[in-house]
């Protein structure tokens, strides 16, 4: 049975600033014709037929659901992209994470300006402080890592706070073994 294709993002963040670039790639096994990819944005068929969809100088209208399809194979699971206009943006490698999988958080400044004196918060409590900005890296996510995250920091010596972001860590499905 042909596998469903999977949409991946590069850079890996699904929350980006207006004006930034992101490439969506339709990955899957045994796809013979690379040029026959269908891309759907908010349910509408895109003109792009390559296995990569480049979003350059992102606009608010680029927000929404993206799916791809190779040949007559099933559509991919949707990926949701959000385009923001703000000073600080908390980005996550995924908003729904399987237990045991890694999770990365990034406090990102508009125009790539340096953010410093950065504090990451989870459920209103400070998690980490860095004078110079660093990503938060959770190598093995657990259900306890679920929560509402945000970050604060200085850009040009001015204080800013990101919008909150809900992260959900779900339990990995148990394998079922059947005795024969």
């Amino acid at each position: 049975v042909p596998q469903k294709p999977k949409v991946s993002l590069n850079p890996p963040w699904n929350r980006i600033f207006k004006g930034e670039n992101v490439t969506l790639t339709c990955n899957g096994n045994n796809f013979f014709e690379v040029s026959s990819t269908k891309w759907f944005h908010n349910g509408s068929l895109s003109e792009e037929t390559n296995s990569s969809l480049n979003i350059v100088n992102a606009k608010f209208e680029d927000s929404g659901e993206y799916k791809c399809q190779h040949q007559q194979v099933n559509e991919s699971e949707p990926v949701y992209l959000e385009v923001f206009s703000d000073w600080l943006l908390l980005q996550a490698s995924a908003e729904v994470v399987m237990e045991g999988q890694p999770l990365f958080l990034r406090c990102h400044g508009w125009r790539n300006w340096d953010v410093y004196k950065v504090i990451y918060y989870k459920d209103g409590e400070a998690l980490k402080y860095w004078y110079e900005n660093h990503n938060i890296s959770i190598t093995n996510a657990t259900v306890e890592d679920s929560g509402t995250y945000y970050c604060t920091g200085k850009v040009w010596q001015l204080d800013y706070e990101s919008e909150p972001l809900n992260i959900t860590v779900i339990k990995a499905p148990r394998e079922k073994y059947w005795l024969q």
């Epitope: 340096d114 410093y116 004196k117 200085k154 010596q157």
Partner: antibody, heavy 121, light 110 residues
Framework: EVQLVESGAEVKKPGSSVKVSCKAS????????ISWVRQAPGQGLEWMGR????????NYAQKFQGRVTITADKSTSTAYMELSSLRSEDTAVYYC??????????????WGQGTTVTVSS | QSVLTQPPSASGTPGQRVTISCSGS????????VNWYQQLPGAAPKLLIY???QRPSGVPDRFSGSKSGTSASLAISGLQSEDEADYYC???????????FGTGTKVTVL
Amino acid sequence: EVQLVESGAEVKKPGSSVKVSCKASGGTFSSYAISWVRQAPGQGLEWMGRIIPILGIANYAQKFQGRVTITADKSTSTAYMELSSLRSEDTAVYYCARVNPFGYYYAMDVWGQGTTVTVSS
Amino acid sequence: QSVLTQPPSASGTPGQRVTISCSGSTSNIGGNSVNWYQQLPGAAPKLLIYANIQRPSGVPDRFSGSKSGTSASLAISGLQSEDEADYYCASWDDSRNGYVFGTGTKVTVL
């Protein structure tokens, strides 16, 4: 390479105002901040304030609050510093300087040539 | 009144090492990066060291910066006659919400 060119020397009467300009060339004006620094004869450097053109935000040293106004015209890549209610102690060389776009260390890496302002009755 | 304190003068013979100190507080040096500027006679200041220890391109490696707590230092090793200038430390000050310069140090090459 970014260059900052300031307007010419000024002689002003006490109580009047002076407006000094600083034109940037060779870089993206919106990507950085412009600071104004002054130096009285034989004295040290004194930060007056700064503007971040793309944000339209200016802030000033407490000493000059209410007397200085820093503005920027993005269309001409020019920053301005206006100092009002001039007194003899304002006689100084006024420098504009580019603040490096990587904001956390606030380093002024390009400077104008300086504008001499003399306040005398 | 400057909030960063430097010695008014320092001197050395060619080839010697000269160190300039800069003393501040938790609201400036203690919590922010330190920059150093060189001002040659009759010229505009020039950035010499940024982010405590970094040298912009074109600045000779005989200039080095350091920071510890609420103090910073600039060292000039292998002093040369063209190093004769005024040197200023500077830092953002959180309590003043502004940038502050040191009092300045005049370096003389004997």
